[in-house]
């Protein structure tokens, strides 16, 4: 985890000021996979290499962010740098550090539910867990699951317990959780949507 981000940063920091400017302009018009948004022009043009790396990873996640960066570099005629970037991101990923769950390689691909995409942020940032549980009780959560989540001492541990049940959920179950989030913490959903 972080290998692709480091490789993107390494590539962008090796660009001259003129090349970085050209990279940003090309990023505004490069074809994107269906479903991906474009980084707003105003924010993009003022970014340095570090900010731009963070923005690329937050908009496209690591795998697609690296692929997109390599495509733009190739389009600029920087084939060798693009090759180095792709080689770096395709090396064996190794084990994730203790306590960190490595995201699936398909993290931002269509077909991955919003709830799954933003698992870590939701665990960290949802505060109104009891409200969610009441909204999901009987529809998605059994009584036993409901009690198990409620028994956890903190909001993050409650959310972590809730997410331990989601692998068994289908798309519509996840939609019901998302609806509850839209109703209880709309600002958080909006924030994650933007990222």
């Amino acid at each position: 985890m972080g290998r692709a981000r480091d490789a993107i940063l390494d590539a962008l920091e090796n660009l001259t000021a003129e090349e970085l400017k050209k990279f940003k302009l090309k990023l505004l018009s490069v074809p994107l996979r269906e479903g991906y948004g474009r980084i707003p022009r105003g924010a993009l043009l003022s970014m340095d290499a570090l900010d731009l790396t963070d923005k690329l990873v937050s908009f496209y996640l690591e795998t697609y962010g690296a692929e997109l960066t390599a495509n733009v570099l190739r389009d600029m005629g920087l084939q060798e740098m693009a090759g180095q970037l792709q080689a770096a991101t395709h090396q064996g990923s190794g084990a994730a550090p203790a306590g960190i769950q490595a995201p699936p390689q398909s993290a931002a691909k269509p077909g991955l539910h919003f709830i799954d995409q933003h698992r870590a942020a939701l665990i960290a940032r949802v505060t109104n867990v009891e409200w969610l549980l009441d909204a999901l009780y009987g529809k998605v959560l059994t009584d036993e699951q409901y009690q198990a989540v409620r028994a956890e001492p903190t909001n993050p541990s409650k959310m972590r317990k809730l997410f331990s049940f989601t692998p068994a959920w289908n798309w519509t179950c996840k939609d019901l959780l998302l609806q509850a989030l839209r109703e209880s913490q709309s600002y958080l959903v909006e924030d994650l949507e933007r990222s």
Epitope: P110, G111, N170, L181, S186, E193
Partner: antibody, heavy 122, light 107 residues
Framework: QVQLVQSGAEVKKPGSSVKVSCKAS????????IHWVRQAPGQGLEWMGY????????MYNEKFQGRVTITADKSTSTAYMELSSLRSEDTAVYYC???????????????WGQGTLVTVSS | EIVLTQSPATLSLSPGERATLSCHAS??????LSWYQQKPGQAPRLLIY???NLHTGIPARFSGSGSGTDFTLTISSLEPEDFAVYYC?????????FGQGTKLEIK
């Protein structure tokens, strides 16, 4: 490009069922939800429900619960909407629609089929 | 379910004028609202999503605003092709619902 092509117009008797198809192309069928929306003559739009072909789960508008069934055939990239126990007030144009993208935090319908007119008449 | 009420039911204006269409939600829907245009015999067309985001390919004369329960679609200077029926739709909770529509007609 994304295309949704629906089956042709149908005339049905009250009490019978109708099954409308929606063939999708131009994207990965199993990655996106397909919704059904109907519009009675001269009236507004009414959401009926959706299917997520990736796991075949469906969600329905409770108004139609028990009468509507939405299914999908992954092998042909086709979604189906079956409405049973038809009555005259079910006469409407039935649209299939695909959201801008399904893994965002909402459903806004950017792609629509051409519509299928279902007439219920004795 | 969330009820969306659009006003006015009919709006009569001339090309070049500014059009303001309203959509009121029966409860708070935050920013989860979209706008569609529909012409006779055609499927609806997405104009605006998440209250104010302009969909790809939609002219800049269309804009959306609002949050909570009150939303507005504005067409800054009407073109002949803008005369149609406009619908709002909420994406906050199920069932998804639409307004009853506003017919924009030539004066």
């Amino acid at each position: 490009q994304v295309q949704l092509v629906q089956s042709g117009a149908e005339v049905k008797k009250p009490g019978s069922s109708v099954k409308v198809s929606c063939k999708a192309s131009g994207y990965t069928f199993t990655d996106q939800t397909i919704h059904w929306v109907r519009q009675a003559p001269g009236q507004g739009l009414e959401w009926m429900g959706y299917i997520y072909p990736g796991d075949s789960s469906a969600m329905y508008n409770e108004k139609f619960q028990g009468r509507v069934t939405i299914t999908a055939d992954k092998s042909t990239s086709t979604a189906y909407m079956e409405l049973s126990s038809l009555r005259s007030e079910d006469t409407a144009v039935y649209y299939c629609a695909r959201p801008l993208y399904s893994y965002a935090s909402y459903y806004w319908f950017a792609y629509w089929g051409q519509g299928t007119l279902v007439t219920v008449s004795s | 379910e969330i009820v969306l009420t659009q006003s006015p039911a009919t709006l009569s204006l001339s090309p070049g004028e500014r059009a303001t269409l309203s959509c009121h939600a029966s409860q708070n829907i935050n920013v989860w609202l979209s706008w569609y245009q529909q012409k006779p015999g055609q499927a609806p067309r997405l104009l605006i999503y998440k209250s104010s985001n302009l969909h790809t390919g939609i002219p800049a004369r269309f804009s959306g605003s609002g949050s909570g329960t009150d939303f507005t679609l504005t067409i800054s200077s009407l073109e002949p092709e803008d005369f149609a029926v406009y619908y709002c739709q909420q994406g906050q909770s199920y069932p998804l619902t639409f307004g009853q529509g506003t017919k924009l007609e030539i004066k």
